[in-house]
Amino acid sequence: PGPPAGSPRVSSDPRADLDSAVLLTRSLLADTRQLAAQMRDKFPADGDHNLDSLPTLAMSAGTLGSLQLPGVLTRLRVDLMSYFRHVQWLRRAAGPSLKTLEPELGALQARLERLLRRLQLLMSRLALPQAAPDQPAVPLGPPASAWGSIRAAHAILGGLHLTLDWAVRGLLLLKTRL
């Protein structure tokens, strides 16, 4: 008899697994782009915003050529975990203004969680070492003001958008090397 209903399919084709991760990443990228646009529309951004607690961008045009699958998946998972925590923090801490975008932020957080699970599954199927247990997460400080939390939201969505954009490119490139 085959595997019990509902159990994960054990794939013998890592390319198919990678495809599925790319699709999820692409979908999340589209969601993030849309939400970032909504944010800009609702709360116009006065220039670029940064948040020290966000991960630095792991990939760039210069590093695409030397990408290795284990490194990319590990780093991507660690960075997306950080963005997941930031979105979670934003939903709980940012004040009433951002509650108007609560359905979208909630959906974004759920999709991020789904992608994180997919990446973890992909790493185990490819027999890649799981990312070392995350360093104890540095608690995210309270926003200094409502205005500060809106700036933080712009920074989080902007950073996540860039990270996902590079992730799609990187994963597609790695797929051709498998």
């Epitope: 609702k42 709360f43 939903r91 709980r92 801490a93 940012a94 004040g95 009433p96 203004s97 509650k99 108007t100 609560e102 309270p142 926003p143 200094a144 003001s145 409502a146 205005w147 500060g148 939390s149 809106i150």
Partner: antibody, heavy 117, light 111 residues
Framework: QVQLVESGGGVVQPGRSLRLSCAAS????????MHWVRQAPGKGLEWVAV????????FYADSVKGRFTISRDNSKNTLYLQMNSLRAEDTAVYYC??????????WGQGTLVTVSS | QSVLTQPPSASGTPGQRVTISCSGS????????VSWYQQLPGTAPKLLIY???LRPSGVPDRFSGSKSGTSASLAISGLRSEDEADYYC???????????FGGGTKLTVLG
């Protein structure tokens, strides 16, 4: 230092209107969401309304929805609460409070509104 | 009837540790941060705890907050006579789209 000073309270008849003001100083008023919270004599705290830092988003307690309007003038560093169709149960001390997120880090001293015929 | 449930009263003797509970639901305490306020007789409330367990500067470390699931609690250790006051818990409620408070707990310091 941060200061919030409410004014405009007094005795008013049921069905009439009153406008409360809250003058803010000691911080960048336009960066903060602002709330009104009230406390009936001998009772607990009851949240009334909040307005976002730039004034576009407003939320109200069900008990005041459609009767009260929260507004702000960032150029004057002032928060307002327009109270219409007042009822006896609106009698309370009204506090304005500043919030960086969902907690109130500074409160005014309060202004008493008495609705009585 | 308050959305968040607190015991109406609590008491202790100087030096004792007292805990005040605050019970809510998944739409408030379960998904948002809890804050606690102290209101001395005849004065405006004062922020004691925010973000579930953080203390603003100036609040003694005798006061601590914690949260688990849909309940939160405020602990006061080394009770002092000046701690006699009303204590309120609060959180945003996603279902009501507003802030909710507990009914308040009157703390009496005996002796």
């Amino acid at each position: 230092q941060v200061q919030l000073v409410e004014s405009g309270g007094g005795v008013v008849q049921p069905g009439r209107s009153l406008r409360l003001s809250c003058a803010a100083s000691g911080f960048t008023f336009s960066h903060y969401d602002m709330h009104w919270v009230r406390q009936a004599p001998g009772k607990g705290l009851e949240w009334v309304a909040v307005i976002s830092y730039e004034g576009s988003n407003k939320f109200y307690a069900d008990s005041v929805k459609g009767r009260f309007t929260i507004s702000r003038d960032n150029s004057k560093n002032t928060l307002y609460l327009q109270m219409n169709s007042l009822r006896a149960e609106d009698t309370a001390v009204y506090y304005c409070a500043r919030t960086p997120g969902f907690h109130f880090d500074y409160w005014g001293q309060g202004t008493l509104v008495t609705v009585s015929s | 009837q308050s959305v968040l449930t607190q015991p109406p009263s609590a008491s202790g003797t100087p030096g004792q540790r007292v805990t005040i509970s605050c019970s809510g639901s998944s739409s408030n305490i379960g998904s948002n941060y809890v804050s606690w306020y102290q209101q001395l007789p005849g004065t405006a409330p004062k922020l004691l705890i925010y973000y579930d367990d953080l203390r603003p500067s100036g609040v003694p470390d005798r006061f601590s907050g914690s949260k688990s699931g849909t309940s939160a609690s405020l602990a006061i250790s080394g009770l002092r006579s000046e701690d006699e006051a009303d204590y309120y818990c609060s959180a945003w409620d996603d279902s009501l789209s507003g802030v909710v408070f507990g009914g308040g707990t009157k703390l009496t310091v005996l002796g």
